[in-house]
Amino acid sequence: TQNKALPENVKYGIVLDAGSSHTSLYIYKWPAEKENDTGVVHQVEECRVKGPGISKFVQKVNEIGIYLTDCMERAREVIPRSQHQETPVYLGATAGMRLLRMESEELADRVLDVVERSLSNYPFDFQGARIITGQEEGAYGWITINYLLGKFSQKTRWFSIVPYETNNQETFGALDLGGASTQVTFVPQNQTIESPDNALQFRLYGKDYNVYTHSFLCYGKDQALWQKLAKDIQVASNEILRDPCFHPGYKKVVNVSDLYKTPCTKRFEMTLPFQQFEIQGIGNYQQCHQSILELFNTSYCPYSQCAFNGIFLPPLQGDFGAFSAFYFVMKFLNLTSEKVSQEKVTEMMKKFCAQPWEEIKTSYAGVKEKYLSEYCFSGTYILSLLLQGYHFTADSWEHIHFIGKIQGSDAGWTLGYMLNLTNMIPAEQPLSTPLSHSTYV
């Protein structure tokens, strides 16, 4: 008689990342008997929900169910039916929803209520939808990349199983860029974290970590662009805004009402003598960079050292993984290679921004014009944020690794979020026989 393969003893988990510009659904899988081991959870699927972020549905909340259908159906297909009822589903909303909540708590709650109702209709074990804090977003991103890089494993190896591995147990810092916020998280070197709001203490796998984190709301790439436009239109002499962050020959009409729709532009709001203005690209990296720097207030710092806007930032330490839009933008610009110096990146950005819009459109015919038009700004913004905002230098630039995936799993906060909520990161180092879950992050 033939040996029948025993059914795989695996578990699944689903996390939806409801970001400001889009929602992604991630499906994770792990061996059931190795729950407490480090590095065993991996991503088996990413489904990008077709459409914008959930905060855009504020005027049509009843349609959120349709919007989520396709990816939830995908989850139903990928996960074996026998596992559906025990598969947890979590939805975490980030800065897009934080901004909506700032405008109206009632509207944000209404969106989340409909999301919860929609997700409860599926055969999974729905665990809730909530707006996660910026601190959580930073912390879970840090946990994700270090978990995937094997930094929490006590077993030292003489060989490298993952990229960027430096064979020591020193953790990587995490740099996350979204559409509406950006996070910086790392373990400083023997440095007191001077502001309690930015301090996290973890005990993971028997080791203590004192982690610095901060989330800059309104400094994601999309909201930073709105801020820059709102700032620059203040000093425009008429309804033409000659903008160095867009390619020469690019033109776009912007409604002033759209500009002032977001809480991020409130500080620049003024009564303008026109309802619309036209952006006219002039494609100049240096001028674009200068304009972006005006978004960072570096004139005051109540601590020994600050990033910007009076936010404490310890001296940078170690290697950093830069993911999400840091990666997507730099990947598009072909600037993710470890060999590309900061000077070379700047040089290439100068050339890219100076290229005429018609030429750019021809070269990248498959890319939606709205996205395509913003890469000059986004690339320049990334450089400005990392160099002037976070104080990376030409020398420390080589410690930044632009990461999309590690071992097949996307870098981002979702894996860390699930590991925590499913109690899969024990405080103590597991013995060979699994311990009962005691304390977790």
Epitope: P52, K56, E73
Partner: antibody
Framework: EVQLVQSGGELVKPGASVKISCKVS????????LNWVRQAPGKGLEWVGN????????RYNQKFKGRFTITIDQSKNTAYMQLNSLRSEDTAVYYC??????????????WGQGTLVTVSS | EIVLTQSPASLSASPGERVTISCSAS?????MHWFQQKPGQAPKLWIY???NLASGVPARFSGSGSGTDYTLTISSMEPEDFATYYC?????????FGQGTKVEIK
């Protein structure tokens, strides 16, 4: 605006194969699933399958799985459907289409003009 | 798969008349979509998510329903409304269409 332009009609013999195409423009190719629907002469609409250009994942109506294959060429912003082992009952207009929410959460649904595939000896 | 059954299969109506088309699903669906198709043309989305009119669709059209039973209603027929109407569910795969209801001039 979104446009889907399909390849011209095809006359093929039973048992033969044909590959039809759908070129899209006006949006980012990876943003939406690309669906194929067919309609036999005088008959109703029948969903064949779709592809998610972002992940490359495909889904098929069980009826067509194994015989019809949906692919994409991202560099050309084009989706294809290969029809194999054709029979006379596969004679139909084949439409490509996509639907979903745009950046402002407005629902849209766009179709190509259709490609008539005639299977006849 | 979810089977959608439309009724009637065809109907004749006069301009100004009220017309109702039903679509019954073999199991519950979250939403129903409706398409209008005229001879030689690709189908056009007419009503989405059960009750929302697609862009450019006149207000005499309406949609309603939930669970397994859905309806498209034309409050007062106009000459341009004579066409075939299909319901479609996009709640689970495979996506399925009703067999169509042909609305002809009496």
């Amino acid at each position: 605006e979104v446009q889907l332009v399909q390849s011209g009609g095809e006359l093929v013999k039973p048992g033969a194969s044909v590959k039809i195409s759908c070129k899209v423009s006006g949006y980012s190719f990876t943003d939406y699933n690309l669906n194929w629907v067919r309609q036999a002469p005088g008959k109703g609409l029948e969903w064949v399958g779709n592809i998610d250009p972002y992940s490359g994942g495909t889904r098929y109506n069980q009826k067509f799985k194994g015989r019809f294959t949906i692919t994409i060429d991202q560099s050309k912003n084009t989706a294809y459907m290969q029809l194999n082992s054709l029979r006379s009952e596969d004679t139909a207009v084949y439409y490509c289409g996509l639907y979903g929410y745009d950046d402002d959460a407005n629902y849209f649904d766009d179709w190509g003009q259709g490609t008539l595939v005639t299977v006849s000896s | 798969e979810i089977v959608l059954t439309q009724s009637p299969a065809s109907l004749s109506a006069s301009p100004g008349e009220r017309v109702t088309i039903s679509c019954s699903a073999s199991s519950s669906v979250s939403y129903m979509h409706w398409f209008q198709q005229k001879p030689g043309q690709a189908p056009k989305l007419w009503i989405y998510a059960t009750s929302n009119l697609a862009s450019g669709v006149p207000a005499r059209f309406s949609g309603s329903g939930s669970g397994t039973d859905y309806t498209l209603t034309i409050s007062s027929m106009e000459p341009e409304d004579f066409a075939t109407y299909y319901c479609q569910q996009r709640s689970s795969y495979p996506l399925t269409f009703g067999q169509g209801t042909k609305v002809e001039i009496k």
